[in-house]
């Protein structure tokens, strides 16, 4: 029986109870390798999951998360609640980022603002809950009388009127 079963391809199972030894997988089941004694039940994308790829006779269904959630795990084994930018998910739900931290995505944790002074630079744009600080040139790089807040206007090409 072993030799006969190994001839059954993916999408079938080795049916000991039937004269035709390889039987197609029943609806809502699959076998992704040959020689299986039974077909596996298809994954059902229910609740916070939605179907990304339907189950076929040779491959399991693949799930995504419904709107307001995002996948965790390589094959979306879990769905985690989205938060707003400027927030992170805690055990008690979505919480605003603490001062000095930011999150520019709907998932993940709040991360500290960049410390511009570590690179010898100054803060050009202050950070917010949603955005990191923007570092500018160090004070020593600025020529006397130059302003760190407004970069010089680009020179216009001849023949072009202002927009």
């Amino acid at each position: 029986l072993q030799d006969l079963c190994s001839n059954c391809p993916a999408g079938t199972f080795c049916d000991n109870n039937r004269s035709q030894i390889c039987s197609p997988c029943p609806p809502n089941s699959f076998s992704s390798a040959g020689g299986q004694r039974t077909c596996d039940i298809c994954r059902q994308c229910k609740g916070v999951f939605k179907t990304r790829k339907e189950c076929s006779s040779t491959s399991n269904a693949e799930c995504d998360c419904i709107s307001g959630y995002h996948c965790l795990g390589a094959e979306c084994s879990m769905c985690e609640q989205d938060c707003k930018q400027g927030q992170e998910l805690t055990k008690k739900g979505c919480k605003d980022c603490c001062f000095g931290t930011f999150n520019d995505q709907k998932r993940g944790i709040c991360r500290p603002w960049t410390n511009c002074s570590l690179d010898g630079k100054s803060v050009l744009v202050n950070g917010t809950k949603e955005r990191d600080v923007v570092c500018g040139p160090s004070p020593a790089d600025l020529s006397p009388g130059a302003s760190s807040a407004t970069p010089p206007a680009p020179a216009r090409e001849p023949g072009h009127s202002p927009q």
């Epitope: 079963c5 190994s6 059954c8 391809p9 993916a10 076998s31 992704s32 390798a33 040959g34 020689g35 299986q36 004694r37 039974t38 077909c39 596996d40 039940i41 994954r43 040779t58 491959s59 399991n60 795990g73 390589a74 094959e75 979306c76 084994s77």
Partner: nanobody, 123 residues
């Protein structure tokens, strides 16, 4: 990255019992079929049994049927092999393995499995 870390092997008397564990990390454990194989010195790697992604269907080699049981705890990302009524011929290095998402080989063929544990000696 994908990792399978085994534990629980050792020395056991004939007729005794042993449980092997295989802890998975780096991937969605509950979306893949898993299997146990063994390899005795000088022999080819031998299929022991396989468990579906959701534990819904199992397949055992005749040599271990009724004595060995495979189970899985998906929330803990762990596969188990419970071995009872052990015999001297069960002496081998035991491996857990993750089934590929698709294979043209049979379910009992080593080529159908893409990631393997480091192996556990059972004597």
């Amino acid at each position: 990255q994908v990792q399978l870390v085994q534990s629980g092997g050792g020395l056991v008397q004939p007729g005794g019992s042993l449980r092997l564990s295989c802890a998975a990390s780096g991937w969605a454990f509950d979306n893949y079929g898993m299997a146990w194989f063994r390899q005795a010195p000088g022999k080819e790697r031998e299929f022991i049994g396989r468990l579906a992604w959701n534990g819904g269907s199992t397949d055992y080699a005749d040599s271990v049927k009724g004595r060995f049981t495979i189970s899985r705890d998906n929330p803990k990302n762990t596969l188990y092999l419970q071995m009872n009524s052990l015999k001297p011929e069960d002496t081998a290095v035991y491996y857990c393995a993750r089934q590929r998402s698709y294979s043209r080989y049979g379910i009992r063929a080593p080529q159908t499995y893409d990631y393997w544990g480091q192996g556990t000696q059972v004597t």
